[in-house]
Interface confidence: low
């Protein structure tokens, strides 16, 4: 066949063994209904075509698969599973695709899958073991490296009365099969808070983005054990101040590079220790941008111009002096 | 692997400005800081400025500032460095090298800027 | 601008015998950000020890760094003939970064 074939035709879909298991024989140049196929680039893209469900009958060469701009819905237990096993799967692409539940072991017998991006997609249910694949307390080692989750957050009526965040973070620590993890995109998500062991059971990151979400505050997340971190992304959060610990932690990593551009800073007493820090870290880019949001009168004031005296926090007024 | 190719040599009138580059591979070009390196012949190096391309943010050497421009091409995974008025002094090598505070892991070969009338 | 001061600004060195290059800074820098380069002609400068004392990823044994505050140091246990070239420190405490002016270590 030739190098890039596009299947108009439907192929007959394969039986599914109770396991999820594609059963049905592969030749090697078949290609899914509604994709494109290039053996010589190892790469299946099936984009913007509406799929309901992963095509069973995927080559079993495919390296790079695009699923983008679909309408999967549920993700099951086993949705890659295959006869022979799509063995040499690295980069796995579902944003997009309107996904509202991935299950537990949704990505199993995926032996040598590399890269995942689930953003842009509204997961209401994202099972603990999605990327574990048991419940066991220990789970095998995950091979993933790279997990985009960025813009993964549901309309606030579909969330299920659950914290987001608390499911996110569940399903990144399950078993710990996350420790080989080098990068993390958690980008636009409307995060409040970080859970206090989100990081414990990703010892090998290199790349944290939290940007563009909601984080009002660090003083209960742990960076220590991060200590290949090489660029934490904080921009375009809540942020007013960083405190002490928060401060040393970053301090004490030898590669990083901290981005906080963008976020709300309260240039009152309670800022002193973090602009002393800048004044002398290298760690933060652009840190010669940072500026004051609050309170009115610091507004605009560039952080690292300030001193001591311009930071005071005022006398807290008795209650039959303030005003509403 | 890593690797930073960088332009073939230059030779410029003074009073003129050239344009260098520096290709990116084997790396997500977004996520490193390069930096651009001046050496003139027998001579130490001398720090120009950095771009970290995947947020645009740029920073120079004062002496620097006003002559040089730093950019970046994220389609390409391509750093530039424009150099302007240039004068004899400008006769050089130009590295471009990736890393950050924890030191330049990986540099290009160089390009050597030649300014003669 | 922090000015970083190498010396010997050359040295020769006999097979097997030990060298210290010394880096000295103008004020004081954070020793994860003191680095130490190695270039020989025609070449690129390699990333030899990072924040102080930490050898680049192929660099022999034989090398060690050290140091805090303004007084930084490159050892060599044992001199060896593929050792010579020149040796830059190099700090990224303060903008703008800035490199000593080299050491130049011949065999002599």
């Known amino acids: 066949s030739s190098p890039t074939s596009s299947a108009s035709s439907s192929s007959s879909s394969a039986p599914f063994l109770a396991s999820a298991v594609s059963a049905q024989p592969l030749l090697p140049g078949q290609c899914p209904a509604l994709c494109e196929c290039s053996e010589a680039a190892r790469t299946v893209k099936c984009v913007n075509r509406n799929l309901t469900e992963v095509p069973t009958d995927l080559p079993p060469y495919v390296r790079n698969l695009f699923l983008t701009g679909n309408q999967l819905a549920v993700l099951p237990a086993g949705a890659f599973a295959r006869v022979p096993p799509l063995a040499e799967l690295a980069a796995l692409n579902l944003s997009g695709s309107r996904l509202e539940d991935v299950q537990a072991g949704a990505f199993e017998h995926l032996p040598s899958l590399r890269q995942l991006d689930l953003s842009h997609n509204p997961l209401a249910v994202l099972s603990p073991f999605a990327f574990s694949g048991s419940n066991a307390s220990v789970s095998a080692p995950s091979p993933l490296v790279e997990l985009i989750l960025n813009h993964i957050v549901p309309p606030e009526d579909e969330r299920n009365n659950r914290s987001f965040e608390g499911m996110v973070v569940a399903a990144l620590r399950a078993g710990g099969a996350l420790h080989g993890l080098h990068r993390l995109e958690l980008a636009s998500n409307h995060f409040l808070y970080l859970p206090r062991d989100v990081l414990a059971q990703l010892p090998s990151l290199r790349h944290l983005d939290l940007s563009n979400n909601s984080l009002v505050s660090l003083t209960y997340v742990s960076f220590r054990n991060l200590t290949h971190l090489e660029s934490l992304h904080l921009e375009d959060n809540a942020l007013k101040v960083l405190h002490n610990g928060t401060l040393a932690e970053l301090q004490g990593l030898p590669h990083v590079r901290v981005f906080l551009d963008n976020n709300p800073w309260v240039c009152d007493c309670h800022m002193a220790d973090m602009v002393a820090w800048l004044k002398e870290t290298e760690v933060v880019q652009g840190k010669y941008q940072l500026t004051c949001a609050f309170p009115e009168k610091m507004r605009n004031r560039v952080l690292l111009e300030l001193n001591s005296a311009d930071l005071d926090c005022d006398p807290i007024l008795p209650p039959s002096l303030q005003t509403s | 692997q890593v690797q930073l190719q960088q332009s073939r040599p230059e030779l410029v009138k003074p009073g003129a400005s050239v344009k260098m580059s520096c290709k990116a591979s084997g790396y997500t070009f977004t996520d490193y800081v390069i930096s651009w390196v001046k050496q003139r012949t027998g001579q130490g190096l001398e720090w120009i400025g950095e771009?970290?391309?995947?947020?645009?943010?740029?920073y120079y050497n004062e002496k620097f500032k006003g002559r040089a421009t730093l950019t970046a091409d994220k389609s390409s995974s391509t750093a530039y460095m424009q150099l302007s008025s240039l004068t004899s002094e400008d006769s050089a090598v130009y590295f471009c090298?990736?890393?950050?505070?924890?030191?330049?892991?990986?540099w290009g070969q160089g390009t050597t800027l030649t300014v003669s009338s | 601008q922090i000015v970083l001061t190498q010396s010997p600004a050359i040295m020769s060195a006999s097979l097997g015998e030990r060298v210290t290059l010394t880096c000295t800074a103008s004020?004081?820098?954070?020793?994860?950000?003191l680095h130490w380069y190695q270039q020989k002609p025609g070449s690129s400068p390699k990333l030899w020890i990072y924040?102080?004392?930490n050898l680049a990823s192929g660099v022999p044994a034989r090398f060690s760094g050290s140091g805090s505050g303004t007084s930084y140091s490159l050892t060599i246990s044992s001199m060896e003939a593929e050792d010579a070239a020149t040796y830059y420190c190099h700090q990224y405490h303060r903008s703008p970064l800035t490199f000593g002016a080299g050491t130049k270590l011949e065999l002599k």
């Open positions: 004020s004081s820098v954070n020793s994860n950000y």
């Open positions: 090298a990736m890393g950050g505070n924890y030191g330049f892991d990986y």
């Open positions: 771009i970290y391309p995947g947020s645009n943010s740029i």
């Open positions: 924040s102080t004392s």
